[in-house]
């Protein structure tokens, strides 16, 4: 159920998960000069029951000054799938996710956490895209990507977002600013059934979100 690949990367855009599906893993990575405590968890895991989801395990880092090496934590064999790294530029300000059962909110930072977060997403995860600072959306179709299971393989849907330098775009007068459309890729372009995901609940949530939620940069 883990997604085999990373979400698509769009030039000059970042993506963000607003909530993490149960089964998502977050590697316990420490910043340079620190390491995981000896008996510490390798990763945090989003788990839950019908009414509540939360992150199991806690990440803990300790100084590695007493060691000769300060090497980064390497993923264990079960974590060797392609990973998505996310740079923590500022503290998270997650939106209220009480209306999204089966999902965990962004875990709070831990002491001496690495500058990147490495998530292992699961089927049904949705991420949202926006242009980085200094760029704007020339075109915005559905600006999200969902990890789906198709023919027994996982794949991410393609977000329809084109980012351009702010001085490079001509806009017709009187045109409204584009909004993300809730529809995914049309069925006519999909050759077989895909596993169902909580599309509706997530797109409803997306429709109420302001761009200020993108407080973490995903590179």
């Amino acid at each position: 159920e883990l997604c085999d690949d990373d979400p698509p990367e769009i030039p000059h855009a970042t993506f963000k998960a607003m909530a993490y599906k149960e089964g998502t893993m977050l590697n316990c990575e420490c910043k340079r000069g620190f390491r995981r405590i000896k008996s510490g968890s390798l990763y945090m895991l989003c788990t839950g029951n019908s009414s509540h989801s939360s992150w199991d395990n806690q990440c803990q880092c300790t100084s590695s000054a007493t060691r000769n090496t300060t090497k980064q934590v390497t993923p264990q064999p079960e974590e060797q799938k392609e990973r998505k790294t996310t740079e923590m530029q500022s503290p998270m300000q997650p939106v209220d996710q009480a209306s999204l059962p089966g999902h965990c909110r962004e875990p709070p930072p831990w002491e001496n956490e690495a500058t990147e977060r490495i998530y292992h997403f699961v089927v049904g995860q949705m991420v949202y895209y926006q242009c980085v600072q200094g760029y704007r959306a020339l075109h915005r179709g559905p600006a999200e990507s969902v990890c789906k299971m198709t023919h027994g393989k996982t794949r991410w849907t393609q977000p329809q977002l084109i980012c351009t330098g702010e001085m490079e775009t001509s806009q017709f007068p009187g045109e409204e600013k584009p909004q993300a459309s809730p529809e995914g890729r049309p069925e006519s372009e999909t050759s077989c059934l895909v596993t169902t995901t909580d599309f509706q609940i997530q797109t409803e949530m997306a429709a109420t979100m302001e761009t200020s939620i993108f407080t973490t940069e995903y590179q």
Epitope: P8, E9, I10, P11, A137, L138, H139, R140, G141, P142, S145, T157, Q158, P159, Q160, I162, T164, G165, E168, T169, S170, Q171, F172, E175, E176, K177, P178, S181, E183, R185, P186, S188, E189
Partner: antibody, heavy 118, light 107 residues
Framework: QVQLQQSGPELVRPGVSVKISCKGS????????MHWVKQSHAKSLEWIGV????????NYNQKFKGKATMTVDKSSSTAYMELARLTSEDSAIYYC???????????WGQGTTLTVSS | DIKMTQSPSSMYASLGERVTITCKAS??????LSWFQQKPGKSPKTLIY???RLVDGVPSRFSGSGSGQDYSLTISSLEYEDMGIYYC?????????FGGGTKLEIK
């Protein structure tokens, strides 16, 4: 299935303008931006620009500013490109191509051959 | 503008042979590179995107690699239907720019 149907070949005199069309079908037209590409013997493939089918935003290759004008008509799911003040150097095949996520062109039109001759 | 230098401009290869075409960008393009195949009288067709991702339906004998400024397209075992012209495209920055093309013919 997804199709981009372009208008037919054009034989025009130097100095005039021509407008070629690209009609999208089999998908939600406004979800995907449209690119235009020129193919000539002299310069192989050249990217002309891209237009948002949703809001009309455009980005042009500087080389084609003043030469090409891209527009869209959402009601007919059609993208247009007008080429002005034509010269023999504009003789080429012009393609429209749909933008798709993190790679630019997943479907192409069949091409419109433009011949500028007196 | 980013200049894409593609080589060779033309080549002959035998059926079953391994073929490699290269593309060099004038600056780092962050792996935002596609490869296209074009056959006479037809529109180009995307083979590879993001430098090494194979488009659905493209035979697995095609592969892409590279990063930074240097990229390559490899056909592991040439088949007759592979003849045509191959182009690279950078889409890291506007304006998008194509390589000059490589004409691949069968010996």
């Amino acid at each position: 299935q997804v199709q981009l149907q372009q208008s037919g070949p054009e034989l025009v005199r130097p100095g005039v303008s021509v407008k070629i069309s690209c009609k999208g079908s089999g998908y939600t037209f406004t979800d995907y931006a449209m690119h235009w590409v020129k193919q000539s013997h002299a310069k192989s493939l050249e990217w002309i620009g891209v237009i948002s089918t949703y809001n009309g935003n455009t980005n042009y290759n500087q080389k084609f500013k003043g030469k090409a004008t891209m527009t869209v008509d959402k009601s007919s799911s059609t993208a247009y490109m007008e080429l002005a003040r034509l010269t023999s150097e504009d003789s080429a095949i012009y393609y429209c191509a749909r933008s798709y996520g993190n790679y630019p062109f997943d479907y192409w039109g069949q091409g419109t051959t433009l011949t500028v001759s007196s | 503008d980013i200049k894409m230098t593609q080589s060779p401009s033309s080549m002959y290869a035998s059926l079953g042979e391994r073929v490699t075409i290269t593309c060099k960008a004038s600056q780092d393009i962050n792996s935002y590179l596609s490869w296209f195949q074009q056959k006479p009288g037809k529109s180009p067709k995307t083979l590879i995107y993001r430098a090494n991702r194979l488009v659905d339906g493209v035979p697995s004998r095609f592969s892409g690699s590279g990063s930074g400024q240097d990229y390559s397209l490899t056909i592991s075992s040439l088949e007759y239907e592979d003849m045509g012209i191959y182009y690279c495209l950078q889409y890291d920055e506007f304006p998008y720019t194509f390589g000059g093309g490589t004409k691949l013919e069968i010996k």
